[in-house]
Structures are given as structure tokens and as C-alpha cells.
Interface confidence: low
């Protein structure tokens, strides 16, 4: 339904607090380098304008679209050209091209300093001195570093962030109370950002149909008792929500997400028995809870799929009448029966089914042609099962750190052109699949592992897209969304790669390594490991292990020395020479 003033409509629906927070997130996700104070000023101006429109929807400019209003506001930033370069050219365009232009300039890896956590007392003082500014700063810092973070979910994180400070800043031991909570928010935030990035990549690179297929499969697993029509309605609404958020339409997205949560809770009897707990919560918690809710139990005595999708003589007739609806029903029926499959596997099966029908429904005897289609599914199911089994065995044998190292070596050999920081980040995250998923029974491993790997490989794809260096990465990332993981798994050592020149500077370490946290020290060692493989891609596991063991001993020795810096300089030279000898460099 059309509103005279879109900005007034959203302000009234969301309330001033959420309106301001969402506009701040939107601006920070677009202009990632702008100082906090500049964004706050812009947000305040937009908010004051919105209030005039609430008072009188016919007032000047109140009828303009949100993109026009926000884009005009962003284009008033004086330093746009010097800070953002060609992004300033967006301002010469008209809507909707201007917004598309801003979206294209979102940077997944902005050149921003690492967020350093101040002392607890400093944070608590800042929180008490000006709670509103403190929380706005949190939204701003997260949004500019994660330009696709799911905005309504970021409001939920901010609410928890506020709750943590409210509770802990009056606790006897502030640090013991606060630091675990902040770690929790940080880790969950990174996971949430990566999951949302995959949704946006799915929509933007592969289109609405790809996202809807993903949503049908996931919601059918989660709500197996819901009818197909109900799942379809939820998929349509969810697609709208994510399309809006991924497109920068954060006010509409948050508003529609709230409506969807309301609808789900009002109709939970026909959706899932697991929603009761979620639906008793306040809005932000409710939406989060619904998004994470566990799968409902499968209905008893579901009939065999073969009857409707293989044995029926009407398969081709039903397919021809409404292809996407029929394939959607196939995906729904298959997914609700298989919570033990990953979503990407279910989508591969649906694609195989579609390809078979396309071929067979044009054949002389269609039924004869597609009668064995389910047999084609077996190898598709077995491939991820076997891969997960092998990798979980390796993880259990090595533990997380060494498992990450095995993946670092594996992926550096596959795609050695990729930057070292990206290879380290992605391989470390790939390695976390072990502790995340391998402890679970067979029936739960695949949805945990393969869908998590899809999220991590998407990180590789979006980082690589910014500065493409490997045709193999581009190929795996762009050919098929659901086959990305099998594509990367199938890559062998890149025989065309010319080894990197040996540079002793890369392997020069200083006493500062001694004061690093265990995680940061691991990253240093893993960075060295990637560089070693780039210098000597044909190095054996044994050679690499020997060098890494020497490196660990070298760090341990020099960190215990009285004159650490001298030790690192002298022993470092010996280590480089020994490593070159061990690797035959």
C-alpha cells in the first residue's frame, strides 16, 4: 500500500530509536571511511527531516523515495572525492542507478585499523558518560567493517552489547563479567556477518531464484510439518526481507522482518511446534530466535517421494504446467524428509532432477528416460559424506590447529596466487569446521559441515572478487553457487604456478611475537607456513613439518632468552639457512 511519505511511514513504524540506528548503519555501510561524527551529523539531519514529514506528509521533499533522500544526503559529504575516489562519480547519477553505484563500491575488506578493545574501566566510564554515543559507536564500527551485516540483527547485537555493559559495569569484578560476554558477541557477530554475506552474494550474483531455492530447502528442513503453500509464502516474504537488506533498504528490511516474525508467531500452529519459546520474546530477540530455531520433528509416515516424482505418469505434464512450482514442491518434499542433508546437497539433487526432466520430457518415452533418476542421486550424496568422514578423521587425529595447517597447505597448493592473509583467514575458518561439526552423530554432520563451508568459501569468493588473481578461484566462485565446495575440493596442485622468490625478510621475526596472544602467535606461524608453500609448492608434508617444528622451537627459545631481540636476529639467520637447506631452496 502506497504512502504519501515513505520516510514518515518508516519512522512511525520503527520508532525514533530504531530509525536512527538503522540510518546510521546504512550510512556507515555505504561510506565506510567517514568519521563517526560526520555520520552522526547526517543521521540527525535525516531524523529531523523525517519528523517534519511525520508532522505533515505533504511537506516539501517528503514524497521523495528513501534512496533519493539518503543518496542526496550522502552526496553532501565534502570529502567524497578525496576519500572515496571514483565512488564520488555515483553522485552524478540518478536513482536507481546512483544506489546501485553505491552498492558496487561497498568494500568487504576496508582498509580500517583493527578494533582494539580498551581497558574495562575505560569502556565502563565511556558507557556511563554517554550511553547513547557509546552504543552508536558500536553500530558504526561494526557496520563500516561489515557492509553487508544484517541490519535488524545488528540492532539485536547492540541490545545485548548494552545489556552486557549495564550488568557488568556495576559488577564486583567487571572484567570477569564483561570480557566473556564481549568475546561471545564478537564471535557470534563474525559468524552472523559471514552467513549474511552468503545470502547477499546468492541474491546479487545468482539471482532471486537461487536464493528462493536455498530458502525453500532450509525452511522445509526446519518446518517439515508446514504445508508447501505455507513454506512458499514464508520464502517469498523472507526473500523480500533479504533483498531489501542486501540492497541497502534497511528501514524497509527491518520493518518487513518484524512483520514476518509477527506472521510466523500468529500462525505457528501451521508452521512449527518449536516456535512457542521464540514467540514469547520481545521483537529483536523473537526475530533472532526464529532465525535460529531448531528443526521441527518430521511428520510420521511421509509417503515415498518416488510416487509423485518418478512413478506418476503426470510428471512431465505437471512439470510443463509450472516448472518452478513443481521443482519447488520436489525440493520441499525432499528437504522435509532429509534434515540430515546439507542445503547445498538438496539443491544439487533438485538441479539434477531438473536437468533430467528437461532432457526426458522431450524424449520419445519420458517415463522410461527418467525412471532411474533417483539412482543418479547416490554419488551426489556419497561425495560429501565421504569427504566429511575423511576430514573428521583427520581433525580428530590432528586437533584444530594442525588441522588448519593441513588445510593451509592444501589450499595454498590449489590456489597459490591468493594473498597470504586471505589464505590464512579462510583456511583457519575452514579448519574450524572440525570442532564445530565433527563431534556430532553422522546424521547431523553434513548439514553442519557443508553449509558452514559454503559460508567460509563465500568469504574467499568475495575477498578474491575485489582483487582477482586466480582464474581457478574465479571459476569455482562464479560457475555454480551450490557446487563451489565440490569445485574447490576437486582442485589439484596448480602446476602452472611459478614459485615465489625466496625473501629472508618474510621469515624475519622479532621479540614482539613473545607478547602476542596464542591466537595471534598461531596466525604468525600459519602466515610463515603459507609463505613456505608459496616458495616451495612441491615440499612434502614431512619437510614442512620439520621446518614448522624448528620454527616453534626457535620462537620458544628466543622468548625465554634474556636478550630476546639479539636471539631473534642471530637464531633467525640460522633458522632461515636450515629451512632453505631442508626445503632444497
Amino acid at each position: 500500500d502506497a504512502h504519501k511519505s515513505e520516510v514518515a511511514h518508516r519512522f512511525k513504524d520503527l520508532g525514533e530509536e530504531n530509525f536512527k540506528a538503522l540510518v546510521l548503519i546504512a550510512f556507515a555501510q555505504y561510506l565506510q571511511q567517514c568519521p563517526f561524527e560526520d555520520h552522526v551529523k547526517l543521521v540527525n539531519e535525516v531524523t529531523e527531516f523525517a519528523k517534519t514529514c511525520v508532522a505533515d506528509e505533504s511537506a516539501e521533499n517528503c514524497d521523495k523515495s528513501l534512496h533519493t533522500l539518503f543518496g542526496d544526503k550522502l552526496c553532501t559529504v565534502a570529502t567524497l572525492r578525496e576519500t572515496y575516489g571514483e565512488m564520488a562519480d555515483c553522485c552524478a547519477k540518478q536513482e536507481p542507478e546512483r544506489n546501485e553505484c553505491f552498492l558496487q563500491h561497498k568494500d568487504d575488506n576496508p582498509n580500517l585499523p583493527r578494533l582494539v578493545r580498551p581497558e574495562v574501566d575505560v569502556m565502563c566510564t565511556a558507557f556511563h558518560d554517554n550511553e547513547e554515543t557509546f552504543l552508536k559507536k558500536y553500530l558504526y564500527e561494526i557496520a563500516r567493517r561489515h557492509p553487508y551485516f544484517y541490519a535488524p540483527e545488528l540492532l539485536f547485537f547492540a541490545k545485548r552489547y548494552k545489556a552486557a555493559f549495564t550488568e557488568c559495569c556495576q559488577a564486583a569484578d567487571k572484567a570477569a563479567c564483561l570480557l566473556p560476554k564481549l568475546d561471545e558477541l564478537r564471535d557470534e557477530g563474525k559468524a552472523s556477518s559471514a552467513k549474511q554475506r552468503l545470502k547477499c552474494a546468492s541474491l546479487q550474483k545468482f539471482g532471486e531464484r537461487a536464493f528462493k531455492a536455498w530458502a525453500v530447502a532450509r525452511l522445509s528442513q526446519r518446518f517439515p510439518k508446514a504445508e508447501f503453500a505455507e513454506v512458499s509464502k514464508l520464502v517469498t516474504d523472507l526473500t523480500k526481507v533479504h533483498t531489501e537488506c542486501c540492497h541497502g533498504d534497511l528501514l524497509e528490511c527491518a520493518d518487513d522482518r518484524a512483520d514476518l516474525a509477527k506472521y510466523i508467531c500468529e500462525n505457528q500452529d501451521s508452521i512449527s511446534s518449536k516456535l512457542k519459546e521464540c514467540c514469547e520474546k520481545p521483537l529483536l530477540e523473537k526475530s533472532h530466535c526464529i532465525a535460529e530455531v531448531e528443526n521441527d520433528e518430521m511428520p510420521a509416515d511421509l509417503p515415498s517421494l518416488a510416487a509423485d516424482f518418478v512413478e506418476s505418469k503426470d510428471v512431465c505434464k505437471n512439470y510443463a504446467e509450472a516448472k518452478d512450482v513443481f521443482l519447488g514442491m520436489f525440493l520441499y518434499e525432499y528437504a522435509r524428509r532429509h534434515p540430515d542433508y546439507s542445503v547445498v546437497l538438496l539443491l544439487r539433487l533438485a538441479k539434477t532432477y531438473e536437468t533430467t526432466l528437461e532432457k526426458c520430457c522431450a524424449a520419445a518415452d519420458p517415463h522410461e528416460c527418467y525412471a532411474k533418476v533417483f539412482d543418479e542421486f547416490k554419488p551426489l550424496v556419497e561425495e560429501p559424506q565421504n569427504l566429511i568422514k575423511q576430514n573428521c578423521e583427520l581433525f580428530e587425529q590432528l586437533g584444530e590447529y594442525k588441522f588448519q595447517n593441513a588445510l593451509l597447505v592444501r589450499y595454498t597448493k590449489k590456489v597459490p596466487q591468493v594473498s597470504t592473509p586471505t589464505l590464512v583467514e579462510v583456511s583457519r575458518n575452514l579448519g574450524k569446521v572440525g570442532s564445530k561439526c565433527c563431534k556430532h552423530p553422522e546424521a547431523k554432520r553434513m548439514p553442519c559441515a557443508e553449509d558452514y563451508l559454503s559460508v567460509v568459501l563465500n568469504q574467499l569468493c568475495v575477498l578474491h572478487e575485489k582483487t582477482p588473481v586466480s582464474d581457478r578461484v574465479t571459476k569455482c566462485c562464479t560457475e555454480s553457487l551450490v557446487n563451489r565446495r565440490p569445485c574447490f575440493s576437486a582442485l589439484e596442485v596448480d602446476e602452472t604456478y611459478v614459485p615465489k622468490e625466496f625473501n629472508a625478510e618474510t621469515f624475519t621475526f622479532h621479540a614482539d611475537i613473545c607478547t602476542l596472544s596464542e591466537k595471534e602467535r598461531q596466525i604468525k606461524k600459519q602466515t610463515a607456513l603459507v609463505e613456505l608453500v608459496k616458495h616451495k609448492p612441491k615440499a612434502t608434508k614431512e619437510q614442512l613439518k620439520a621446518v614448522m617444528d624448528d620454527f616453534a622451537a626457535f620462537v620458544e627459545k628466543c622468548c625465554k632468552a634474556d636478550d630476546k631481540e639479539t636471539c631473534f636476529a642471530e637464531e633467525g639467520k640460522k633458522l632461515v639457512a636450515a629451512s632453505q637447506a631442508a626445503l632444497g631452496l
Epitope: 545485548r160 545489556a163 552486557a164 550488568e167 563479567c177 570480557l179 566473556p180 560476554k181 568475546d183 561471545e184 564471535d187 557470534e188 559468524a191 533472532h288 530466535c289 535460529e292 530455531v293 531448531e294 528443526n295 574450524k432 570442532s435 564445530k436 561439526c437 563431534k439 556430532h440 547431523k444 554432520r445 548439514p447 553442519c448
Partner: nanobody
């Protein structure tokens, strides 16, 4: 090596109480959300309760709400399950589990598991 060791199980009459403990070692306890699952003979394992890393967020299954309470002591690396007003249908092996993230979803989100402690509610 990560270990989760449950204790406090036993036989109790309907309406009685028990307090289960789960002592964790080999992991940074305050970095893990904790949960209790249970499995009755011949039934699937189900999640009963969970608590976030900082203790600020809890989840209770409908069947135990108002009767069971989860708590944690990060200084002692221990999570507790206080079970009051026990019923025969609470009879099961209770498992303690640890998750890297706040786990509102399925059991596959939990990374580490204990061996379990048996609770029998019988008159």
C-alpha cells in the same frame, strides 16, 4: 584434551530434586556456551537447557520450564543443572555439552560432549 565430566545423577522419587554438575577441562570454559541434553531409553537425544558463555542468555525446553534451572561458574569451570519437581518422564541419561557459539539450534552446534549421568525418577 577436552573433558566434560557429569556428576550428581541417581535415583529419586517423583517430586524430588537433584543437582547435576558438569566439570570442564581442556578448554577455555568462558568461551563456550553450555547445554544439557537428555536421552531416554529408545528415544532421541533432546536438548533440555542451555546457557550462553557469559551466563546472560538461557534456553529451557517447554517440558522443564519452571522446574529446572541452569547456572554456570566460570571461575570453577562448572555448569550446574538444578532439577526440582522431578517426574517419571524426566528419567534419562543427562549429557553436558559445550558449544563455541550461543546455540539456539540443533545438537550439531555443540562441539564437545560428556559421557552422561543417569537420572531415574521412580517410586
Amino acid at each position: 584434551e577436552v573433558q566434560l565430566v557429569e556428576s550428581g545423577g541417581g535415583v529419586v522419587q517423583p517430586g524430588g530434586s537433584l543437582r547435576l554438575s558438569c566439570a570442564a577441562s581442556g578448554l577455555t570454559f568462558s568461551s563456550y556456551a553450555m547445554g544439557w541434553f537428555r536421552q531416554a531409553p529408545g528415544k532421541e537425544r533432546e536438548r533440555v537447557v542451555s546457557i550462553s558463555r557469559g551466563g546472560g542468555y538461557t534456553y529451557y525446553a517447554d517440558s522443564v520450564k519452571g522446574r529446572f534451572t541452569i547456572s554456570r561458574d566460570n571461575s570453577e569451570n562448572t555448569v550446574y543443572l538444578q532439577m526440582n519437581s522431578l517426574r517419571p518422564e524426566d528419567t534419562a541419561t543427562y549429557y553436558c555439552a559445550a558449544a563455541r557459539y550461543w546455540a539456539t539450534g540443533s545438537e550439531y552446534e555443540f562441539d564437545y560432549w560428556g559421557q552422561g549421568t543417569l537420572v531415574t525418577v521412580s517410586s
